[in-house]
Structures are given as structure tokens and as C-alpha cells.
């Protein structure tokens, strides 16, 4: 029975950019200005979204698709269809509740966005620290201790299993 | 002595879901950043995901719409919901907590297998 009065409906044939109109007996209107739909047999067209203050427009709306919006020169996206447009730091830094901050000691951002995460634990994988870490870049790890010293086998064992907990680089 | 604790791990299907917990025992507070690291057999150990103290978050490529981070400071605890796993996910999941480079702790490690 549903699928009879689906294709008895007569808004099943109102195309996208247009809405079925109850108003004008159930004939397909087209969107008024700043409208869309974008699949067939709606009764309403949506309101476009309008992109405003620290958005910018990406897209523009048509009657068929919402407009998209992105940020403007420096902030950048955040969430779902950049829903909220968050404030770029330096890289080195992050976004904190009192705005930009350097990263602290031992860790690094090397992105505008996002936050200062800790240097790589070099010793983790048995390696030593080949350079050294700084606030936009993370440290490079190199060969083992091991293997840098004078006259060392060319087979080292594996590094000892280090017993997770206060590990300081 | 502090300890971290993780829970949660597990089989699980790929599609599946998993939620990680990591406690703390011990005196520990005013934790800067929390993060979770995995490693797979015969990989470095890699962050997976961060949040600091403000609630800013950091996420691997691979994982970003799928799992996501939160901690709870009065319980000096944190999570790590993890929805649409693949096999590629598999690995040992750490909890780290990180006050400063001087002073930070590790977890044992939890095994999560996502396989059919």
C-alpha cells in the first residue's frame, strides 16, 4: 500500500531546485532566492547558509545545493562542514583559552593548528636521539647507543623491555 | 609510585567499536596532556591521539573521524572511543600522561585485535 501511494504522490515528481507546493495544489514551485533543495519530492526548500564574518564563501548556494563556506586568512576550519572557524598560531604554538602560547619545553607543533604533543621517546625503541627536538619539530632518532660506539658488533641484541612508567627522554 | 592502568581492549570485529579507559593510582595531578600511543609488532610506537589541559586535541591522520579522545580530570582519568576499526588498527594501546619532559608515565599496554 505504501509503495502505491508513493507512486500516486504527486511530489514525487517535483525535482531537486524545486518544492511541492500545498499552496498551489501540490504543483512544483521553484525555490524562492536564497533556497535550495537538493533531492526531489521536498515540500519546503531549505534557507541557504550565509557565510558571514570570519567566514568566507567557498561555494555559492544554488537552488539545488547549499552555499559551503570556509575561514578567513588566519583561522581554518573546525568540525563538520567547517562549521566553526578556529584562530591559527605560529607553529611552536597552540591554541590555549588565553590565546597563542609558545610550546613548552619537550614538546612541539610543526602546524599552525592543533596542539604541542610531546617529543618522540627515542630510547622507547632502543635508539638514541639523533637530533635534538625543538618547539616546531620533533626530535629525529638515530641508530642504538649501541651501534654508534667504537668497535660494536654488527648484531645487537634486542634493547631490554623497559618497564612502562616515569620515563624521562 | 604512580601507575597508569589502561582497560577496555580486546577482539572485535572490523566495524566493530572499542572503548579504552586509563586510570591513574598513585599521587598524580595537574596532568598537562594525556595521550594514547600504539605499536604494532615490528613498527615504532606512534601517538595515535592527544588532549591538553584546555581540551585541544591532536589526532593521527588514519584515525581522525573515527576515534575520538576525552579525559575526565577529576577522575584523572581518560578514553579513547575507537568506532569503525580495521585491521590496520591492531596493535598494543599505551595511555601516557605527560606533566612535563622531565616527569611523564606510561601505561602496561592493552592488545587490540581487530580481525573476522
Known amino acids: 500500500f505504501e509503495r502505491t501511494r508513493s507512486l500516486q504522490d504527486p511530489c514525487s515528481n517535483c525535482p531537486a531546485g524545486t518544492f511541492c507546493d500545498n499552496n498551489r495544489n501540490q504543483i512544483c514551485s521553484p525555490c524562492p532566492p536564497n533556497s535550495f533543495s537538493s533531492a526531489g519530492g521536498q515540500r519546503t526548500c531549505d534557507i541557504c547558509r550565509q557565510c558571514k564574518g570570519v567566514f568566507r564563501t567557498r561555494k555559492e548556494c544554488s537552488s539545488t545545493s547549499n552555499a559551503e563556506c570556509d575561514c578567513t586568512p588566519g583561522f581554518h576550519c573546525l568540525g563538520a562542514g567547517c562549521s566553526m572557524c578556529e584562530q591559527d598560531c605560529k607553529q611552536g604554538q597552540e591554541l590555549t583559552k588565553k590565546g597563542c602560547k609558545d610550546c613548552c619545553f619537550g614538546t612541539f607543533n610543526d602546524q599552525k593548528r592543533g596542539i604541542c604533543r610531546p617529543w618522540t621517546n627515542c630510547s622507547l625503541d632502543g635508539k638514541s636521539v639523533l637530533v635534538n627536538g625543538t618547539k616546531e619539530r620533533d626530535v629525529v632518532c638515530g641508530p642504538s647507543p649501541a651501534d654508534l660506539s667504537p668497535g660494536a658488533s654488527s648484531v645487537t641484541p634486542p634493547a631490554p623491555a623497559r618497564e612502562p612508567g616515569h620515563s624521562p627522554q | 609510585a604512580v601507575q597508569l592502568v589502561e582497560s577496555g581492549g580486546g577482539l572485535v570485529q572490523p566495524g566493530g567499536s572499542l572503548r579504552l579507559s586509563c586510570a591513574a593510582s598513585?599521587?598524580?595531578?595537574?596532568?598537562?596532556?594525556m595521550g594514547w600511543y600504539r605499536q604494532a609488532p615490528g613498527k615504532q610506537r606512534e601517538l595515535v591521539a592527544m588532549?591538553?589541559?584546555?581540551?585541544?586535541?591532536y589526532y593521527l591522520d588514519s584515525v581522525k573521524g573515527r576515534f575520538t579522545i576525552s579525559r575526565d580530570n577529576a577522575k584523572i582519568a581518560m578514553y579513547l572511543q575507537m568506532n569503525s576499526l580495521k585491521s590496520e588498527d591492531t596493535a598494543v594501546y599505551y595511555c601516557?600522561?605527560?606533566?612535563?619532559?622531565?616527569?611523564?608515565?606510561w601505561g602496561k599496554g592493552t592488545q587490540v585485535t581487530v580481525s573476522s
Open positions: 588532549i591538553n589541559s584546555s581540551g585541544g586535541t
Open positions: 601516557h600522561y605527560w606533566i612535563s619532559h622531565e616527569m611523564n608515565y
Open positions: 598513585g599521587s598524580i595531578f595537574s596532568i598537562d596532556r
